[in-house]
């Protein structure tokens, strides 16, 4: 729900957004994701910090854990055991990388209202989770995995070889966390808690990135992270499974790697339990165009895991890499052998397929010149998924239900017509057996979260409608937003344009391009946001545009894989092409055009500025990649191959920012980076700066001491204030 536009007579009561509004998060929104614990119950942390259990069927709420108990250990998170006898309380949160953190854990016994004393958990713990049934605990401490049958029991140590920065058990190393698993954990309970599977990552031979952390001491600390850059030695991964009922009986059993994968460097990509005695592992060749899904069964007689070749399913891409950003994961059906999976169809669009015996015989479930994006849930009679099919807008997400119990299967869009103007971008969260589900709408209007009946799709109640935000925005002059497309040389370029509130087509406006542009990304989405660029349009009168060019996702493989093995070419070309088209629209002041981006966007903005087109007056790169040889192997090689002479070294060398140093002479360039960036290392900006200095090219720079890739906290305020000054100066806007 965008607040409705007011007539001119009322406009004096309206005010523009301020930078302070943005930095204070004045117009941030809330979402409501139920913490499902059964088919009809969920947990939620109330405004006063009580943990409340809500039963949808009876309409009853129960306070199962008081804020007093939470506060007694300074808990910031909690987890109820599946038997509902215990809760773990998490405190002393200490962030590590994107997903990982350590914490202190306390176990609270709900049956007697006391904390479990005796055999307390060590601290800090790297990961802890309940078994899916009962109240067994698995946790990782100092890179080793431990098991408790009950919270008060002494622990059973499963692994012994864990070593900081060397061997990781049950948790990923840096590159697996960031680029493969996207989780802080690498252990998986079987559905009934009989077995525990885990990954062991051996980083012994991986080169280490070292950078200074300045802190407050007399001498800076050195942070060392095993970090494989493109072409470097990678982690060696092994998967083990242990019987948690009798863990000492045979100990952990290694799961065999498919022969066609093991013949050269490879990755483990994900693990999915099917039943207590069947597990599905996904593997990927280092050259990431071949993925193998392997279904393994427990052999009671040998107490080992058997992965027959007949249960190996190969997914191969001939036009790019396997999958989208990641290879998709299977969703198994009730027969525990067939599954649903998203992969490219013959027309090059990612769609849901049903695999019963072989991938070759897969039955295509969805089809069309759009893409299926996520399979949320498969029940006995329905499959719920999201796609961007509706009205042919790739930047939308709607939830669909396909009836799989009937033939032919019928398809219903659950969300398309619910709040059509307000809500065009949804995700969903399902209870057990999809008895109920929550829909979270992210926009383009004010976000709203609702609860629905899984059988009838009927809305039961609103969980969060952001009423306060709606009221707060009533007197704000928000920019106008439009999502449209450009057709250029058989390529469709979708763009989002953010226009000043009193936009007048007959006037000329400065243009800022905000770019990300990384492979399989999407910037043009129908979502609500009041952010820095909203302020630039509302208060400073800029036009801001976001363009999804070649390499971006959800529009088919032709667009996605266009950048394969040539990063830094088409992404930049398409931004430039779009700018030229925008100029042709007649309301852009072509002497005042800027571009900015962060991370991959910083790389693209730098290359665009150095393209020699004369289009851009200025631009900003925040934490940019400057050479693909400096970035992580798993990510980089997926799209670029290896930096070797017989593979793709030439394009690695051709695609650096440094190689274009001379071209920065005629633009104003602001280069920004955090010195403690574990992801895109400060090295990237250091090398750009060196090349610019060597070419005697003037530029502006800002570093953020001890800040990582996110530039959070006070750095955020400083960053956006600094970038605002830079752009206003560039566009000759008075402060």
């Amino acid at each position: 729900l965008r607040p409705s536009r007011v007539h001119n007579s009322e406009e004096n009561t309206m005010r523009a957004l301020t930078l302070k509004d943005i930095l204070n998060g004045t117009f941030s929104y809330k979402t409501f994701f139920p913490n499902w614990i059964s088919g009809q119950e969920y947990l939620h942390q109330s405004a006063d910090n009580n943990i409340v259990l809500y039963n949808i069927e009876t309409g009853q709420s129960y306070t199962i854990l008081s804020n007093r108990t939470m506060k007694s250990v300074n808990a910031s998170n909690y987890g109820l055991s599946p038997d509902r006898q215990f809760v773990y309380l998490e405190s002393d949160y200490s962030k590590l990388w994107r997903y990982s953190y350590t914490a202190t854990y306390y176990i609270y016994d709900l049956s007697n209202g006391e904390f479990v004393r005796g055999n307390e958990l060590p601290r800090p713990i790297q990961y802890l989770c309940w078994s899916p049934v009962g109240s067994k605990l698995a946790y990782v401490y100092q890179n080793n995995i431990y098991l408790k049958q009950r919270p008060g029991d002494p622990p059973f140590q499963i692994t012994f070889n864990g070593r900081e920065n060397k061997i990781f058990n049950g948790i990923p190393d840096w590159v697996y966390e960031e680029e493969m698993l996207a989780t802080k954990y690498a252990l998986w309970w079987s559905p009934n808690g009989k077995f525990l599977a885990y990954a062991e990552f051996n980083d012994t031979d991986i080169p280490v990135i070292a950078y200074s952390y300045y802190g407050d001491e007399q001498y800076p600390r050195t942070i060392n992270i095993p970090y494989p850059k493109a072409g470097a030695k990678n982690p060696v991964v092994r998967i083990f499974i242990i019987d948690t009922t009798y863990p000492a009986y045979v100990g952990p059993q290694e799961v065999p790697v498919p022969a066609m994968i093991a013949s050269s460097d490879y990755y483990f990509s994900w693990l999915t339990w099917v039943t207590d005695e069947r597990v599905c592992l996904q593997w990927l060749k280092r050259v990431q165009n071949v993925s193998v899904l392997s279904i393994c069964d427990f052999r009671e007689d040998w107490q080992t895991w058997d992965c027959p070749k007949t249960q190996e399913h190969i997914e191969e891409s001939r036009t790019g890499w396997a999958g989208g950003f990641f290879v998709s994961t299977p969703v198994f059906s009730y027969d525990a052998i067939s599954y649903y999976k998203i992969f490219s169809d013959k027309d090059g669009y990612k769609h849901i397929h049903y695999i019963k015996d072989t991938v070759e015989n897969a039955i295509q479930i969805t089809s069309g010149k759009w893409e299926a994006i996520n399979i949320f849930r498969v029940t006995q009679d329905s499959l719920f998924y999201s796609s961007n099919e509706f009205e042919e807008y790739p930047g939308r997400r709607n939830i669909y239900r396909i009836s799989i119990g009937s033939y032919p299967p019928s398809k219903k869009c659950v969300t398309c017509h619910l709040r059509k103007e307000r809500c065009q971008y949804y995700t969903a969260s399902f209870s057990d057996y999809a008895k109920y589900y929550a829909l979270v709408c992210y926009g383009p209007g004010i976000p709203i979260s609702t609860l629905h009946d899984g059988r009838t799709d009927q809305e039961i109640k609103i969980l969060e409608e952001n009423k306060e935000l709606e009221n707060a925005l009533k007197n704000i002059q928000l920019p106008k937003e439009e999502i449209k497309k450009l057709e250029v040389d058989e390529i469709t370029l979708w763009y989002k344009m953010i226009l000043p509130p009193q936009f007048d087509r007959s006037k000329k406006y400065p243009l800022l391009i905000q770019v990300y542009g990384g492979p399989c990304s999407q910037s043009v989405r129908s979502v609500f946001a009041v952010n820095w660029i909203s302020y630039l349009a509302s208060k400073e009168g800029m036009v801001i545009a976001l363009v999804d060019g070649r390499g971006t996702a959800f529009q088919g493989d032709k667009l996605l894989y266009a950048v394969y093995r040539k990063l830094g070419v088409y992404e930049v070309e398409d931004q430039i092409t779009a700018v030229r088209k925008f100029i042709e629209m007649g309301f852009i002041d072509e002497k005042r055009i800027a571009i900015w981006g962060w991370s991959y966007g910083g790389y693209v903005s730098s290359l665009a500025l150095a393209s020699g087109t004369g289009l851009f007056k200025c631009g900003i790169a925040v934490a940019p990649v400057s050479s693909w040889e400096y970035y992580a192997s798993v990510y980089t090689e997926r799209f670029m191959g290896l930096p070797t002479k017989d593979d793709n070294l030439e394009h690695y060398k051709n695609s650096t920012v440094m190689a274009r140093a001379e071209y920065f002479r005629n633009v104003d360039y602001l280069l920004i980076h955090g010195t403690a960036d574990d992801n895109v290392h400060f090295q990237n900006s250091a090398q750009i700066a060196k090349a610019l200095v060597n070419a005697q090219v003037d530029f502006q720079a800002m570093w953020y001491s001890d800040q990582n890739h996110g530039l959070s906290g006070l750095s955020t305020n400083h960053l956006y204030t600094h970038m605002t000054h830079f752009l206003k100066q560039c566009f000759s806007l008075s402060d």
């Epitope: 129960y62 306070t63 709900l110």
Partner: antibody, heavy 119, light 107 residues
Framework: QVQLQESGPGLVKPSETLSLTCTVS????????INWIRQPPGKGLEWIGL???????NYNPSLKSRVTISKDTSKNQFSLKLSSVTAADTAVYYC?????????????WGQGTLVTVSS | DIQMTQSPSSLSASVGDRVTITCKAS??????VAWYQQKPGKAPKLLIY???YRYTGVPSRFSGSGSGTDFTFTISSLQPEDIATYYC?????????FGGGTKVEIK
């Protein structure tokens, strides 16, 4: 510790109303529902009904027209009223705690009170 | 109403024996079945809830299993103090219903 204590007259005349009170302690009323169960001498258990934590009620259809369960949160008390009683209502009446932490099973029982319906 | 049919209605076993009681629901109750122990003149006590979860403080010789319509309650090694009547109950929907009970005696 958790306690539930039923009280009320041990003898009720036919056609009159049986009234029982259950006083509870040792747990928070925001966490649990209170059920009433009865057991005729030498027979099995029968669920009468419950009062939810939020105050709503649910009754056994076989008794619905005659039963009322209510609560007085300030006194930590719950009451059961069963009207138009007959000899078939002679039973030990239990006040029982239930709630989501045991999937709405019945985890704490009062010791029960025997009510005889006789003239 | 959901009917709970419990069998046997009584059984006699020796100390140390494995004792099994079954309960059949007239319709799917998922795993929402509880088992209670009642000794003469006493109130019932919760042993198992949600088909297989042992209630706090209940000895490990008592166990439960099943889902849907068929449920089993087992005493792995019968002890003298286990002499009682055992009831199953569905806590899936209202009205909550009990099985008829199984009286366990020592041979």
């Amino acid at each position: 510790q958790v306690q539930l204590q039923e009280s009320g007259p041990g003898l009720v005349k036919p056609s009159e109303t049986l009234s029982l009170t259950c006083t509870v302690s040792g747990f928070s009323l925001t966490n649990y529902d209170i059920n009433w169960i009865r057991q005729p001498p030498g027979k099995g258990l029968e669920w009468i009904g419950l009062i939810w934590t939020g105050g709503g009620t649910n009754y056994n259809p076989s008794l619905k027209s005659r039963v009322t369960i209510s609560k007085d949160t300030s006194k930590n008390q719950f009451s059961l009223k069963l009207s138009s009683v007959t000899a078939a209502d002679t039973a030990v009446y239990y006040c029982v705690r239930g709630g989501p932490l045991v999937w709405y099973a019945l985890d704490y029982w009062g010791q029960g009170t025997l009510v005889t319906v006789s003239s | 109403d959901i009917q709970m049919t419990q069998s046997p209605s009584s059984l006699s076993a020796s100390v140390g024996d494995r004792v099994t009681i079954t309960c059949k629901a007239s319709q799917d109750v998922s795993t929402a079945v509880a088992w209670y122990q009642q000794k003469p003149g006493k109130a019932p006590k919760l042993l198992i809830y949600s088909a297989s979860y042992r209630y706090t403080g209940v000895p490990s010789r008592f166990s439960g299993s099943g889902s849907g319509t068929d449920f089993t309650f087992t005493i792995s090694s019968l002890q003298p103090e286990d002499i009682a009547t055992y009831y199953c109950q569905q806590h899936y929907s209202n009205p909550r219903t009990f099985g008829g009970g199984t009286k366990v005696e020592i041979k």
